[in-house]
């Protein structure tokens, strides 16, 4: 259930509505519930998350990261900079959201409901940022080659790549959710 | 079982510089934020500097910040604290704490504690 | 820099008392509260997180309430045992904060 739909906000209507924050907010803290549950199940199928980050480093996945210069951590904190950062990361990751479906057997739904509650967070973000000419969309031809290329791997890489989009999406979120809370 | 073991603390003078370093064992250090939390004598717990798992996203108290730096080193399941131009007030038991999280909690709080480490700054 | 205030900072009770601390944010931290307790000569131990979540071996008269604003940390019926400092801490937003903690303390 996506946030603001829960039999909670259905039984207290007196209730403040949310703020635009509030409801970023708790968007992504939605999607990384989703993110954990998924992690989980594949946690339990593969010995993936105890590797090492020497060992991942191998796959030459071009994940979204953040680093000092995006302006979202602490020091050098610049909050335009930043949202563009989360916008742009986002919109990236759609690719390999699109790549984790089909890839859960008991969470399939949930794999579904973070590829979507996604989008929506998105939307969020994209009316809060001021200068929408800064970000910049992934090109949709290098995306369905990347897809191609994605589902193509062994099944051991295909896991692995799993593994990593998931780690890796999470901190991404969890690194937003710390700068968009300093905004 | 988790644990976590200071080292590195001691007696320095004012504007000196100490290194703290934290082994850890018994987790996937890679995947937990760590955090380094003190107590001085006789007073209350004080958040010191947090870093992230992977991003290199660190944070600090505004009491250290430009003067402490935090660092992790995954591959030898060690977690960091520099501490330079250190001042009387920094006179602290300084723990190095694990966030809760790793695959799945999301919310702040440190479920374990190392004995911690006694930094003394006094000339 | 959100303000976390604690009160009491020193509660005298009896055994088998309620016991009911405290914690005001100066801003809303949604959930993002956590609480310790801490015995004199050791080190704290984590009893709540996520304002309401008991954590893992910690006794069931132990529980937590609030969001945004105002949270609470009761103890049905406290124990010998329970006797400590006891902190919260905000970790919503960085520099996170502890309160200022509540010795409990027999009357």
């Known amino acids: 259930v996506p946030p603001g739909e829960d039999s909670k906000d259905v039984a207290a209507p007196h209730r403040q509505p949310l703020t635009s924050s509030e409801r970023i907010d708790k968007q992504i803290r939605y999607i990384l519930d989703g993110i954990s549950a998924l992690r989980k199940e594949t946690c339990n199928k593969s010995n993936m998350c105890e590797s090492s980050k020497e060992a991942l480093a191998e796959n030459n996945l071009n994940l979204p990261k953040m680093a000092e210069k995006d302006g979202c951590f602490q020091s050098g904190f610049n909050e335009e900079t930043c949202l563009v950062k989360i916008i742009t990361g986002l919109l990236e990751f759609e690719v390999y959201l699109e790549y984790l479906q089909n890839r859960f057997e008991s969470s399939e739904e949930q794999a579904r409901a973070v590829q979507m509650s996604t989008k929506v967070l998105i939307q969020f973000l994209q009316k809060k940022a001021k200068n929408l000419d800064a970000i910049t969309t992934p090109d949709p031809t290098t995306n369905a080659s990347l897809l191609t290329k994605l589902q193509a791997q062994n099944q051991w890489l295909q896991d692995m790549t799993t593994h990593l989009i998931l780690r890796s999406f999470k901190e991404f979120l969890q690194s937003s959710l710390r700068a968009l809370r300093q905004m | 079982q988790v644990q976590l073991v200071e080292s590195g603390g001691g007696l320095v003078q004012p504007g000196g510089s100490l290194r703290l370093s934290c082994a850890a064992s018994g987790f996937t250090f890679s995947n937990y934020y760590m955090t380094w939390v003190r107590q001085a004598p006789g007073k209350g717990l004080e958040w010191v500097s947090s870093?992230?798992?992977?991003?290199?996203?660190?944070a600090y108290a505004d009491s250290v910040k430009g003067r402490f730096t935090i660092s992790r080193d995954n591959a030898k399941n060690t977690l960091y604290l520099q501490m330079n131009s250190l001042k009387s007030e920094d006179t602290a038991v300084y723990y190095c704490?694990?966030?809760?999280?790793?695959?799945?909690?999301?919310?702040?709080?440190?479920?374990?504690w190392g004995q911690g480490t006694q930094v003394t700054v006094s000339s | 820099d959100i303000q976390m205030t604690q009160s009491p900072s020193s509660l005298p009770t009896s055994l088998g008392d309620s016991v009911t601390i405290t914690c005001q944010a100066s801003q809303s931290i949604s959930d993002e509260l956590s609480w310790y307790q801490q015995k004199p000569g050791q080190t704290p131990k984590l009893l709540i997180y996520g304002a309401s979540k008991l954590q893992t071996g910690v006794p069931s008269r132990f529980s937590g309430s609030g969001s945004g604003t105002s949270f609470t940390l009761t103890i049905s019926g406290l124990e010998a045992e329970d006797l400590a400092t006891y902190y919260c801490l905000q970790g919503y937003s960085w520099p996170f904060m502890f309160g200022q903690g509540t010795k409990v303390e027999l009357k």
């Open positions: 870093i992230y798992s992977f991003s290199g996203d660190t």
């Open positions: 704490t694990r966030n809760l999280g790793g695959v799945v909690v999301t919310t702040n709080g440190y479920d374990y």
